[in-house]
């Protein structure tokens, strides 16, 4: 007897972090035997959507013409073949930005820091929030997060970096969010360029240099003072 149908692959284009009002396409790829594709969204009545396969029947397109809060969340897809329904795909987390006003990102004591010294990136929001996220452009694991303990809401979060090396240099943005939906983020802060000077391997780095995507300090959980470590956002959500 044949085993369970292989699970399909689920992804989003142009990506899984979408600004409010922008379009996004969710793709589910199964097998050539697929007769129907179904998309389910966690914590919502099912089925979320159903589509007939596109030729040659091994995938289906689920279109979101304008991103809103209703569409943010965690999705899985399935396909139906003549022998039944497939296993669910791995989850896709669709995040919407623009749900709240943008926070302010600053560096203390300065965005120009000497290698080996310490710097703290400070993300501040106008209204109290309970989750703050720091993103570094082109990092291998760009999302780092700091959540208030016990759901307490606050206006800022500190992301300390010590000791700083040249790998910490680059462009950062931060977001804020409420705990009731991890999938709704604020507008992004204005970018902050962190410039690391004085290191032997990179004495005068250019602010516009590309940032390495190899594992480095930016890939490690930052350790906020007096709080538990916070890990990559995806690991936290799952």
């Amino acid at each position: 007897q044949a085993g369970p149908l292989p699970k399909p692959t689920l992804w989003a284009e142009p990506g899984s972090v979408i600004s409010w009002g922008n379009s996004v396409t969710i793709w589910c790829q199964g097998t050539l035997e697929a007769r129907e594709y179904r998309l389910d969204k966690e914590e919502s009545p099912a089925p979320w959507d159903r589509q007939n396969p596109l030729e040659p029947k091994n995938k289906a397109r689920f279109s979101i013409p304008s991103m809103t809060e209703d569409y943010a969340g965690r999705y899985r897809c399935y396909y139906r073949s003549p022998v039944g329904w497939s296993q669910p795909s791995d989850p896709l987390e669709l995040v919407m930005t623009g749900a709240y006003s943008k926070p302010t990102l600053s560096a203390l004591p300065s965005p120009l820091v000497t290698s080996g010294k310490s710097v703290t990136l400070l993300c501040q929001s106008r209204s109290p929030m309970d989750t703050f996220l720091l993103i570094k452009e082109r990092a291998a694991h760009p999302l780092l997060h700091l959540r208030s303990e016990h759901g307490a809401q606050q206006h800022q979060a500190e992301f300390p970096m010590s000791p700083v090396t040249s790998v910490h240099g680059g462009t950062y943005r931060c977001f804020s969010s409420h705990g009731f939906s991890h999938y709704l983020l604020s507008h992004p802060s204005d970018p902050l360029e962190l410039i690391v000077s004085g290191s032997l391997e990179d004495p005068r780095p250019s602010p516009t240099r590309s940032v390495s995507t190899a594992a480095g300090p930016e890939d490690q959980p930052l350790m906020p003072t007096g709080s538990v470590p916070h890990s990559g956002l995806r690991r936290h959500w799952e």
């Epitope: 919502s44 009545p45 089925p47 959507d49």
Partner: nanobody, 121 residues
């Protein structure tokens, strides 16, 4: 062939209760979110409640705490229990079926003919 058939509408006093039923064909019921819309004279159609094949429900803000929705898989039927009825609940109530995203877009795939609910003393 009529695929969604509503029943249970009528005249009820303010504060009273009513239970609407919708019978569906098995093929529609087994693979769709089932729900209820309503439309009052001169107003837009609005989603009242919906329930998925996974049992999860969505209740409209205007009826939260007063209306509940349930589905009976053995009878291919969905029910809307309406309590603490108000004059503003007066409308034609429509049974609907489709994927949930169609409910968000106010365009389910299947519609019933509607049943009148009038709340008046």
């Amino acid at each position: 062939e009529v695929q969604l058939v509503e029943s249970g509408g009528g005249l009820v006093q303010p504060g009273g209760s009513l239970r609407l039923s919708c019978a569906a064909s098995e093929s529609i019921f087994s693979s769709n979110v089932m729900g209820w819309y309503r439309q009052a004279p001169g107003k837009q159609r609005e989603l009242v409640a919906a329930v998925g094949i996974n049992g999860l429900t969505k209740i409209g803000d205007s009826v939260k705490g007063r209306f509940t929705i349930s589905r009976d898989n053995a009878k291919n039927s969905v029910y809307l229990q309406m309590n603490s009825l108000r004059a503003e609940d007066t409308a034609v109530y429509y049974c609907a079926a489709g994927a949930y995203v169609r409910f968000l877009q106010n365009s389910p795939d299947y519609w019933g003919q509607g049943t009148q609910v009038t709340v008046s003393s």
